[in-house]
Interface confidence: low
């Protein structure tokens, strides 16, 4: 009775169970009653990352420097190349097919989380008592100056974009 299902790492062809090619190798010819499955290693800059019956290996991903990409991990016959972005840029997707410049936080917003190669800058509004007067990918919201600790008084109130302005206390003569 010909098999209808095969064991793990096998495939059914012509009513026969043949061995799959191991990762890093491609199928050249199916097994027969008398011969084993014939597999060949993937060429340079090619890979296959699973047990397979593929007749062609996949090309390694190209980390295109024109799109701000560079190689994070070189591919092998069993793994694809992993791309990342040049410093100051981050990937636009998990696959990292292209990069964009890190976002800056506008005045009134501070950096909550600095960008990485795979995630953008996370900004947060400066809460009451804090300000940011610059557009920056690194600066957090700064606390308003404490006039009291300098024995001064608030002359001009602070905003989310400006620090308070301190001035001398009016002393009764």
């Amino acid at each position: 009775e010909p098999p209808t299902a095969c064991r793990e790492k096998q495939y059914l062809i012509n009513s026969q169970c043949c061995s799959l090619c191991q990762p890093g190798q491609k199928l050249v010819s199916d097994c027969t009653e008398f011969t084993e499955t014939e597999c060949l290693p993937c060429g340079e800059s090619e890979f296959l990352d699973t047990w397979n019956r593929e007749t062609h290996c996949h090309q390694h991903k190209y980390c295109d420097p024109n799109l701000g990409l560079r190689v994070q991990q070189k591919g092998t016959s069993e793994t694809d190349t992993i791309c990342t972005c040049e410093e100051g840029w981050h990937c636009t997707s998990e696959a990292c097919e292209s990069c964009v410049l890190h976002r800056s936080c506008s005045p009134g917003f501070g950096v909550k989380q600095i960008a990485t190669g795979v995630s953008d800058t996370i900004c947060e509004p400066c809460p009451v008592g804090f300000f940011s007067n610059v557009s920056s990918a690194f600066e957090k919201c700064h606390p308003w100056t404490s006039c009291e600790t300098k024995d001064l008084v608030v002359q001009q109130a602070g905003t989310n974009k400006t620090d308070v302005v301190c001035g001398p206390q009016d002393r009764l003569r």
Partner: antibody
Framework: QEQLKESGGGLVTPGTALTLTCTAS????????MNWVRQAPGKGLEYIGV??????IYYANWATGRFTISKASSTTVDLKTTRLTTEDTATYFC??????????????WGPGTLVTVSS | DVVMTQTPPSVSEPVGGTVTIKCQAS??????LAWYQQTPGQPPKLLGY???NLASGVSSRFSGSGYGTEFTLTISDLECADAATYYC????????????FGGGTEVVVK
């Protein structure tokens, strides 16, 4: 002082091919992406294409096959046009990108060269 | 190529006023967006890039914001020197790389 200057413009007849040259002074452009942009009289800006620092060239869809960008030296970039029509009458600008990669940030511009296509 | 829709085509505001210009991209362009100012007879001048980064030497009265498909340029405390045409330039760098300008906004300062 870093400057870009376009040359090669002028009055040409329809069907003519033309080569415009962008020359940098004060620095070389080998580590920057160089872009070409045009502007018809009284109209908006139109992006043509870019050559990156590593020599890869990208064209706007409408410009593919109509223009050829090449880097002639570390200080010059050329824009070759094929079979000009009256619709190609425009001021042609070259502009340097902020990095060597493709970018929308074009920080240094030439004054432009006017190409007039007329019979 | 990505299509950039810029609004309004023209705007008139008094000195000291505020102008807001919007650019909408036909697809997600992340923060690949720059803003330019152009006065007659002059080449464009870069105001900001990467959506919210101000170019060197540009007044902090100009500010850019947005991400993905919606972007804004705000000019506050308008001065006579701000009278110009403003353009956005959006870039898509996926499988079809390309930059596209918006149609422009003429700013008249009264």
């Amino acid at each position: 002082q870093e400057q870009l200057k376009e040359s090669g413009g002028g009055l040409v007849t329809p069907g003519t091919a033309l080569t415009l040259t962008c020359t940098a002074s004060g620095s070389d452009i080998s580590s920057y992406a160089m872009n070409w942009v045009r502007q018809a009289p009284g109209k908006g800006l139109e992006y043509i294409g870019v050559i990156t620092s590593s020599g890869t060239i990208y064209y706007a869809n409408w410009a593919t096959g109509r223009f050829t960008i090449s880097k002639a030296s570390s200080t010059t970039v050329d824009l070759k046009t094929t079979r000009l029509t009256t619709e190609d009458t425009a001021t042609y600008f070259c502009a340097r990108g902020i990095t060597g990669a493709v970018t929308t940030g074009l920080s240094l511009w030439g004054p432009g060269t006017l190409v007039t296509v007329s019979s | 190529d990505v299509v950039m829709t810029q609004t309004p085509p023209s705007v008139s505001e008094p000195v000291g006023g505020t102008v807001t210009i919007k650019c909408q991209a036909s697809q997600n362009i992340y923060n690949n967006l720059a803003w330019y100012q152009q006065t007659p007879g002059q080449p464009p001048k870069l105001l900001g890039y990467a959506a919210s980064n101000l170019a060197s030497g540009v007044s902090s009265r100009f500010s850019g914001s947005g991400y993905g498909t919606e972007f804004t340029l705000t000019i506050s405390d308008l001065e006579c020197a701000d009278a110009a045409t403003y353009y956005c330039l959006g870039g898509y760098y996926g499988n079809n790389v390309g930059n596209t300008f918006g149609g422009g906004t003429e700013v008249v300062v009264k």
